[in-house]
Interface confidence: low
Amino acid sequence: WPPPGTGDVVVQAPTQVPGFLGDSVTLPCYLQVPNMEVTHVSQLTWARHGESGSMAVFHQTQGPSYSESKRLEFVAARLGAELRNASLRMFGLRVEDEGNYTCLFVTFPQGSRSVDIWLRVLAKPQNTAEVQKVQLTGEPVPMARCVSTGGRPPAQITWHSDLGGMPNTSQVPGFLSGTVTVTSLWILVPSSQVDGKNVTCKVEHESFEKPQLLTVNLTVYYPPEVSISGYDNNWYLGQNEATLTCDARSNPEPTGYNWSTTMGPLPPFAVAQGAQLLIRPVDKPINTTLICNVTNALGARQAELTVQVKEGPPSEHSGISRN
């Protein structure tokens, strides 16, 4: 607020007033009259810069007159009362209301006294974030999308992630005139390692007390990544039953597991149980390459493992045996 003057009547008002689109706002404006000063106010006038005529007038005997009577109202000025408060309420704020306004007091004997006020019209945006479900492409693609709808001024969107990635941000006019919808895409080369990880969209706007954080859980669709575990290169005759596991990571989940060997179907000592393969005890050495083929909605992938059951030294107890 400007400091009051000394020895003269002074109009007091903030230099800037914020208001929200569609809401009402009061443009405060007061005449400060020093104790020893005598003044007679005959009119209060509001005018908008760049427009001819007044948008609102309060006349000492005629009362209030408004350029748009449905949208304007003197808050405190009353007929028969001293006109010291010219504060004006504006209803149903529109984008085009943003601008500079002059509040003017017509006084005697001091003459006219005025002040300028900048009305800033804001619109609070609505924010959403969503995953962009992708497949392995080998190229950078949008993996997350953050949208700030109907902000005025436009919201600022940033991304926070340990995964790298690049933002691609664009703006289009919002549904309400003068508002802006900001869309930001988070772009990265999809990989299975990214699937299920989080990225955070941060939306900043002057209507927010603090930035809004929206978390997106990434989704990458990829065919199975397959490996076989459970073999330690140390199997001997006389050993108990063993189990091999076909480990598959995929999105969506695997729909089927198929065990075979490079020679064709499984030998009698190997029994498939879904993702697991039961190796029964054998009485003679073997050297077989096993294959696990895993299928999901995107395709099939396989892993191979060569298993050897060796003759061990008689003194050792390890090995595959019938017990």
Partner: antibody, heavy 116, light 107 residues
């Protein structure tokens, strides 16, 4: 339902006065300014003035200043217009109209005939 | 006083026609113009306020446009019940003033 019901037709001699009433219902009388507009037969509309029932503040067309008096009775939600020093050219239908910048509701009109 | 000059003063049109009535203010009145319809023996009825805003209940064939000094009332497809006189009014400054009216007849 908003209604503005005016008093009946008047026949007056030149130099006399006429007082027309406008009884309102269906809304809060003190929240809207009441204005008066007249229309000579077959001619256009002419704004006379307005009064705010709550403050009593008035605004008059200079053409009628000194001859017209606008008053209200808040207890009966009624507005009045008195026009004095009548002349033949005051012959017209007089309307009360609720003001919203423009005039959103009008009375049915009161015919005032000034004739010797 | 601001003069509101309306044209034409009278016109005849057929049902289904597009009708345009204009109003010119002697000085800038912003968008502070209203349009009224007055049928014989009745008070005026508000159609349009603030130059281009239709009152609720007013058929959407009525539309208003303009700002500053030049204003237009358009009836997109004339109906028989639109037989009436139409007035513009400025409410930018006192005294409020009306156009002289346009009498619309149906052919």
């Amino acid at each position: 339902e908003v209604q503005l019901v005016q008093s009946g037709s008047e026949l007056k001699k030149p130099g006399a006065s006429v007082k027309i009433s406008c009884k309102t219902s269906g809304y809060t009388f003190t929240e809207y300014t009441m204005h008066w507009v007249r229309q000579p037969h077959g001619k256009g509309l002419e704004w006379i003035g307005g009064i705010h029932p709550n403050s009593g503040g008035t605004s008059y067309n200079q053409r009628f200043k000194g001859r017209v008096t606008l008053t209200v009775d808040k207890s009966t939600s009624t507005a009045y217009m008195e026009l004095s020093s009548l002349r033949s050219e005051d012959t017209a239908v007089y309307y009360c109209a609720r003001w919203t910048g423009d005039f959103d509701y009008w009375g049915q009109g009161t015919l005032v005939t000034v004739s010797s | 006083d601001i003069q509101m000059t309306q044209s034409p003063s009278a016109m005849s049109a057929s049902v289904g026609d597009r009708v345009t009535i204009t109003c010119k203010a002697s000085q800038n009145v912003g968008t502070n113009v209203a349009w009224y319809q007055q049928k014989p023996g009745q008070p005026p009825k508000a159609l349009i306020y603030s130059a281009s805003y239709r009152y609720s209940g007013v058929p959407d064939r009525f539309s208003g446009s303009g700002s500053g000094t030049d204003f237009t009332l358009t009836i997109s497809s004339l109906q028989a019940e639109d037989l009436a006189e139409y007035f513009c009014q400025q409410y930018q400054s006192y005294p409020y003033t009306f156009g002289q009216g346009t009498k619309l007849e149906i052919k």
